[in-house]
Amino acid sequence: QPPPPPPDATCHQVRSFFQRLQPGLKWVPETPVPGSDLQVCLPKGPTCCSRKMEEKYQLTARLNMEQLLQSASMELKFLIIQNAAVFQEAFEIVVRHAKNYTNAMFKNNYPSLTPQAFEFVGEFFTDVSLYILGSDINVDDMVNELFDSLFPVIYTQLMNPGLPDSALDINECLRGARRDLKVFGNFPKLIMTQVSKSLQVTRIFLQALNLGIEVINTTDHLKFSKDCGRMLTRMWYCSYCQGLMMVKPCGGYCNVVMQGCMAGVVEIDKYWREYILSLEELVNGMYRIYDMENVLLGLFSTIHDSIQYVQKNAGKLTTTIGKLCAHSQQRQYRSAYYPEDLFIDKKVLKVAHVEHEETLSSRRRELIQKLKSFISFYSALPGYICSHSPVAENDTLCWNGQELVERYSQKAARNGMKNQFNLHELKMKGPEPVVSQIIDKLKHINQLLRTMSMPKGRVLDKNLDEEGFESGDCGDDEDECIGGSGDGMIKVKNQLRFLAELAYDLDVDDAPGNSQQATPKDNEISTFHNLGNVHSPLK
């Protein structure tokens, strides 16, 4: 083994380097000293380091490490932050469009129900938005409130428009009757099923992305232990004490040090992998009644069908409710009020056509593919950091923490380290409390993601009732069937498309009208999207 080169007789190089770290030279010896007070850079001979310099090196080493860790995670962090924001905004746009669709349906088909219907629809979709963002709201309660609020208006405006003002204090009775008499048939239950399933999945998807950001932020801002600081100092700075300014640490040595320093962080790896794979499973299942875009943008149709159901049974209902809510029936229900053949002016939305069409669904899949390229992020961190900090290639003529060596030997380096502190002990301490906490959060979100994900081979839930309505019972090659009253079944094409200008706003006046399409599929609508021409019959 070659003898170490003689240290700089005046410590001049060390002084000039150290001055960059710490202005002022009071801590740097003029000439090499025995260094008996040193605790990290144990000298084999005279040294150009003092105890104070060693402390400064340790602080700098830990700061360097934190910066390396932050730069290592920058791309991943940006990917998740950007997508969390994009999806949150996209989901809000879907909700806004769904609200406008529903308002347009009332405006075009039931003008006498507005503006009360607008108010109830607005409240419902506000709750939908809040639920997606994590509010503690019960979806069934939201749907019940919508129908409870709508029925008194439908009854007094559509079914019994001649009711005297004195009879209009029966709202509470009508709200109760709505549930007791199942006046909307099974439509509220159908909507509950579809809305709750799709919103739960949407909400957990957003929560998972936000937790991903929290995981990266947690590991980004980890404070490394003093033991780690000493190891890093030995690796990066102790060579300077011997005047070896241009020597780089051995690559193998760097890996050993990084594994020791990052033992706690690497424990996240298993749960991070599970997180990405569980998120992928969830995304794969986000279609049909598990796709909020599909469900919400077709909601206007189901609500429309539910009102038609009430109108078809209006005769029976009016008599029963007349008795139940004890008001004199002023006017017989008029079938002319049933807008079966109501024709609404054709409305065609013209929006600038963009060649590149990106659906929410494809955007989700794209995110998963990108995330999967980071599946080994935590296990690869020690290697990544070593490859992005100065190390000697091929482990030749490099610093092993004690001396300049021609070839790096892991065994010799480990033995050398044992004089300082036990690397095994460093690993056995277990993760920092913040790492334990983030691991538990990851475990929990993974449980939620797996709970939400549809097991392979499981058929979509069938909620069959007396009227024979089924939830999620369309063939695999079809889009989700929304509604299901038998007549006027509407298939909704999942077509909300992504643009840079995500915030495109749709006013009620611009909502899809009742356009007759000269195609065999005149029952099929393309839901509003911010691309292309849209023909949407509302009937």
């Epitope: 994590g134 538990d440 929990h444």
Partner: antibody, heavy 115, light 107 residues
């Protein structure tokens, strides 16, 4: 020292309500999901409910769905279980447990539903 | 829901014996399985998490193995304080479910 202490158990008539509390100490309560688990006399363990660390997600066993509500107050480091429409079969020792891995449990509180 | 089936429901053994308890899940849960020990009048205590990881402070005579649907808890040399009831539990997805328990008694 990490500790969970359940309170609020007692004897109650069928159809009535009871609210259990679980006071947490010695750890960052707001960073952990929390569970309720019960054990009927002479029987095995039955998971009851879970609440996410921020309270945003709740799951229940089918046997208690619609009757029990799990909640938490992170500012008070306390977990709750509101039990309504109690039945004889809800008679059990109720435990709270910490985290997705349920690594720490309280000593339990006894709920007896009897007329 | 994922069903957990434990066997045997009870066993008699002597101090120093090697004891094995098995647990089967109705569908794959990978390694999302925990083992608990419960003594009369006491709360359950976590022994093993993620099928094979020993919880801090638990003696090394306890070990866990398995993945997918079949799991095993082994006590290499039974000690007097090990006489208790043991439960397996899946923590893969909700609702979380426990096995029915295995009571280890003194022969």
């Amino acid at each position: 020292e990490v500790q969970l202490v359940e309170t609020g158990g007692g004897v109650v008539q069928p159809g009535r309500s009871l609210r259990l509390s679980c006071a947490a100490s010695g750890f960052t309560f707001s960073s952990y999901a929390m569970h309720w688990v019960r054990q009927a006399p002479g029987k095995g363990l039955e998971w009851v409910a879970v609440i996410s660390y921020d309270g945003s997600n709740k799951y229940y066993a089918d046997s208690v769905k619609g009757r029990f509500t799990i909640s938490r107050d992170n500012s008070k480091n306390t977990l709750y279980l509101q039990m309504n429409s109690l039945r004889a079969e809800d008679t059990a020792v109720y435990y709270c447990a910490r985290g997705a891995g349920m690594d720490v449990w309280g000593q339990g509180t006894t709920v007896t539903v009897s007329s | 829901d994922i069903q957990m089936t434990q066997s045997p429901s009870s066993l008699s053994a002597s101090v120093g014996d090697r004891v094995t308890i098995t647990c089967r899940a109705s569908q794959s849960i990978e390694d999302d399985l925990a083992w608990y020990q419960q003594k009369p009048g006491k709360a359950p205590k976590l022994l093993i998490y993620e099928a094979s990881n020993l919880q801090s402070g638990v003696p090394s005579r306890f070990s866990g193995s398995g993945s997918g649907t079949d799991f095993t808890l082994t006590i290499s040399s039974l000690q007097p304080e090990d006489f208790a009831t043991y439960y397996c539990q899946q923590h893969d997805s909700y609702p979380l479910t426990f096995g029915q328990g295995t009571k280890v008694e003194i022969k």
